[in-house]
């Protein structure tokens, strides 16, 4: 079943997917779609990867991490109601049906009226715990079960401090991640 | 250490073609991708598209798609760049550059640039 | 294409100053961001990539910052050597797009 990931109207969600590369610069490609992940590729792509740069997205949807070192999460901007639903991050290994799929479940829930005293963060999601192995063929990734919600709208730094800090490895550790190699 | 020398000036018609080399020295040719940017007379850079040398992978800016072709002949590490069709407004200096993995591909090192006058 | 604004076309300075050239992205480009300086007659030199990682080389008072959008890179004591035309480049997309770039020149 997928993973369910949850923000408010108005502000940005995120969808966690990492791949760790075999070498530095060996990239894969990477697409992100509308709906669950069908047997090839991403349906309804909103964004895509190729071995070096972003060459396709659409309006709102943008990779705020290090894609180049293999964080592919997904920032959705400024999302609506229609937003909620399935989305597929294909990390797409060369070879016949070596690719990774993940199904992450966003739900958007209508925004509180409630003044906000600080600075707001973007989302509140529940990480997963992933584990992955390391073996001659694809890799495997088994969910551990979950963690308690992380609400993020407590913590008053912005993206980029995050990213430095000992949460945003939580976060690396305990989003859709596989190892590639 | 790495250089980077390209084809010297070039005059050409509108409606011509131009091909522009760009001979790399002092790093492992196939390890980085080679970029292609130009600057018209007192303006910006704009990227025209990249090869990457080690499986021929191009990638194209679609403002030039069609017109604009870039090969690599390792045995000599050279990489070029081919624009046709030509009109006024490709009178430019046209760069190569290298990008790699490690600086997240940005151009570090350029070649001295190639003066091309497209003039009836 | 995501556009790269550098709105000051050209910037007075003097030796010994604190300067600070912007740059603004049309849409989020994380921090995927360079900085190159440009003398008359030259190519581009690379100073500063993935928003605030100075290239190889590079003086320590050429400093970059920021994430998202906006992007600065601050020269901390300027020097004469240092007028010359820089030009910020995102590196997220492609196709890479240029600012239109920022001629520093002296009071």
């Known amino acids: 079943s997928e993973v369910e990931y949850r923000a408010e109207v108005g502000q940005n969600a995120y969808l966690p997917c990492f791949y760790t590369p075999a070498a530095p610069g060996n990239l894969v490609p990477v697409c992100w779609g509308k709906g669950a992940c069908p047997v090839f590729e991403c349906g309804n792509v909103v964004l895509r990867t190729d071995e070096r740069d972003v060459n396709y997205w659409t309006s709102r949807y943008w990779l705020n991490g290090d894609f180049r070192k293999g964080d592919v999460s997904l920032t959705i901007e400024n999302v609506t109601l229609a937003d909620s639903g399935i989305y597929c991050c294909r990390i797409q290994i060369p070879g016949i049906m070596n690719d990774e799929k993940f199904n992450l479940k966003l739900v958007i829930k209508p925004a509180k009226v409630t003044p906000a005293p600080t600075r707001q963060r973007d989302f509140t999601a529940a990480f997963p715990r992933m584990l992955t192995t390391r073996g001659h063929g694809p890799a495997e990734t088994q969910t551990l079960g979950s963690l308690p919600d992380i609400n993020l709208t407590q913590i008053s730094t912005l993206a980029n401090e995050l990213r430095d800090s000992r949460l945003a490895n939580d976060l690396r550790d305990s989003g859709a991640t596989i190892r590639i190699g | 250490q790495v250089q980077l020398v390209q084809s010297g000036a070039e005059v050409k018609k509108p409606g011509a073609s131009v091909k522009v080399s760009c001979k790399a020295s002092?790093?492992?040719?196939?390890?980085?991708?080679m970029d292609w940017v130009r600057q018209a007379p007192g303006q910006g850079l704009e990227w025209l598209g990249y090869?990457?040398?080690?499986?021929?992978?191009?990638s194209y800016n679609q403002k030039f798609k069609g017109r604009v072709t870039m090969t690599t002949d390792k045995s000599t590490s050279t990489a070029y760049m081919e624009l046709r069709s030509l009109r006024s407004d490709d009178t430019a200096v046209y760069y190569c550059?290298?990008?790699?993995?490690?600086?997240?591909?940005?151009?570090?090192?350029w070649g001295q640039g190639t003066t091309v006058t497209v003039s009836s | 294409d995501i556009v790269m604004t550098q709105s000051q076309k050209f910037m007075s300075t003097s030796v010994g100053d604190r300067v600070s050239i912007t740059c603004k992205a049309s849409?989020?480009?994380?921090?995927?961001v360079a900085w190159y300086q440009q003398k008359p007659g030259q190519s581009p030199k690379l100073l500063i990539y993935?928003?605030?990682n100075r290239y190889t080389g590079v003086p320590d008072r050429f400093t970059g910052s920021g994430s998202g959008t906006d992007f600065t890179l601050t020269i901390s004591n300027m020097q004469s050597e240092d007028l010359a035309d820089y030009f910020c480049?995102?590196?997220?997309?492609?196709?890479?797009?240029f600012g239109g770039g920022t001629k520093l020149e002296i009071k």
């Open positions: 550059a290298r990008s790699g993995y490690g600086n997240y591909y940005t151009m570090d090192y």
């Open positions: 002092g790093y492992t040719f196939t390890d980085y991708y």
């Open positions: 090869i990457y040398p080690n499986n021929g992978g191009t």
């Open positions: 849409q989020s480009v994380g921090n995927n």
């Open positions: 993935y928003a605030s």
């Open positions: 480049q995102q590196h997220y997309s492609s196709p890479s797009t």
